[in-house]
Interface confidence: low
Amino acid sequence: EAHKSEIAHRYNDLGEQHFKGLVLIAFSQYLQKCSYDEHAKLVQEVTDFAKTCVADESAANCDKSLHTLFGDKLCAIPNLRENYGELADCCTKQEPERNECFLQHKDDNPSLPPFERPEAEAMCTSFKENPTTFMGHYLHEVARRHPYFYAPELLYYAEQYNEILTQCCAEADKESCLTPKLDGVKEKALVSSVRQRMKCSSMQKFGERAFKAWAVARLSQTFPNADFAEITKLATDLTKVNKECCHGDLLECADDRAELAKYMCENQATISSKLQTCCDKPLLKKAHCLSEVEHDTMPADLPAIAADFVEDQEVCKNYAEAKDVFLGTFLYEYSRRHPDYSVSLLLRLAKKYEATLEKCCAEANPPACYGTVLAEFQPLVEEPKNLVKTNCDLYEKLGEYGFQNAILVRYTQKAPQVSTPTLVEAARNLGRVGTKCCTLPEDQRLPCVEDYLSAILNRVCLLHEKTPVSEHVTKCCSGSLVERRPCFSALTVDETYVPKEFKAETFTFHSDICTLPEKEKQIKKQTALAELVKHKPKATAEQLKTVMDDFAQFLDTCCKAADKDTCFSTEGPNLVTRCKDALA
């Protein structure tokens, strides 16, 4: 239904707290360099204006679209061109082009310092002094570093953060209470960020149809008792919610997500028997819970998929009459039978089925042609299954850090032109798949591994798009989203690469490494490992292991030495010589 004032409508629906949080996220995601105080001032102005519209929907400017209101606010910021360069050119455009322009200037890798967590006492003091400002800072800092973070979900993480601080700041040992809990929230939020970015990439590159197909597969796996009409309705609504968030329409997105959660809770009988626990929770927790609810029990009496999609005499007729609906029912039926497959795999199978029908339905004897289609799925299914087995075996043997190193070597060989920081970040993230997925029950491993890897590789593609340097990466990133992971897995050593010169300074370390936290130490060592591979792309695993063991031993010895500086300056050059010899 149309509202006289869109901003008043959203303020009323969302309430002041969520309204302000979402506006802050929106501004922080668009203008990623502005300080919290600058954004907080804008948010207050927008909120005050919304309140005047709530009081009188006919008041001046209350009938303007949210894009117009928000865009005008952003364009009024002083020194926009000095701080943001060509983004300021967006302000010369009219809506909707102005918003599109803002979206195109979102930076997936902004040059901001890492978000450092203050020490416990300081955090608790500032939280107690002003919890609202404290949480505002959290929203601002996360949103500007992750310009596509799913806004209503970020409000959920802020709520989690708030609850943890409320609990832990009352404890004697604040540090040991806060650290593991906040680390847990951070890990989940980072995964949520790459997953959502993947959804926005799907939407931006391949349109709503591609996203809707993803949603149908995912929802059919989770709700196998829901009928196709129900799944289609949920997928359509979910597509709308994600389109809005990816497009910067955060108030609409959060409002529609709340509506979808309400609908699901009011229609449990036609959706799933597993929803009640989620539906008992307050809004943010409810929507989060529904998004990761366990799969419902599969109906016991599902007929074989072949009946309707291979053996039925009307296959080509049904396909020709309504291609999208027929393929949609195939995806639904296959997905509800296979909660053990990844969504990417299910979409590859649907694509294979579509290609088979396109080819066979044009032939003289279609049934003879498409009769073997299900058997042709076998290699497509075996490939990710083998990937999971091989990688989980390796993870179990090496542990997370060793597994990350193995992936780092593999990916540096595949794409040695990619910058070392990007390779290290990618390998560390890809390596976490072991901890995240390999410990799960067998039937949950494949969906966990492949869908997580796809999301991480999407980030690799986004970073590479900014400065394309590797033909290998460009080739894999320009294909369809669901083919990316198999494409990257199939890459081998890049034979076109001219090895890097050996530079001693790349492998020269100083005593300051000794005081770094363990994570930073690992990154330093992994940076050296990537550089070694760039110098010797065809080095064997044994050679690299020898060098890295020697390097670890060197660090251990010098960090324990009484005179660390002397140890590093005398032993360092010897290490460099030994490395060169080992790789000769």
Partner: nanobody, 115 residues
Framework: EVQLVESGGGLVQSGGSLRLSCAAS????????MSWVRQAPGKGPEWVSA????????RYAESVKGRFTISRDNAKKTLYLQMNSLKPEDTAVYYC????????GSQGTQVTVSS
Amino acid sequence: EVQLVESGGGLVQSGGSLRLSCAASGFTFGSFGMSWVRQAPGKGPEWVSAIDGGGADTRYAESVKGRFTISRDNAKKTLYLQMNSLKPEDTAVYYCTIGQSTSRGSQGTQVTVSS
């Protein structure tokens, strides 16, 4: 198609009793928690009581605790509400709902308690 049909309402004197039934069809009844909700004239829906799928866990609104009892028979796909010591303020249309939702998907049954 999901269907919920309530019955058992009527006019009763203050202090009297009624037993409401709700016949369910079109879904796996035993897998879902169920609730009773009521709506008095001119007021919003008010949640009354809930029961889990197996029938072991029951919950009540403060206003009906000790007077009303919710139960279910999964074999018959039926939900019940035994209402004792009825008061005039219990006058409302009573609906059964799936889960613990206050949304009304059925016709309801009228309960009128006269003083």
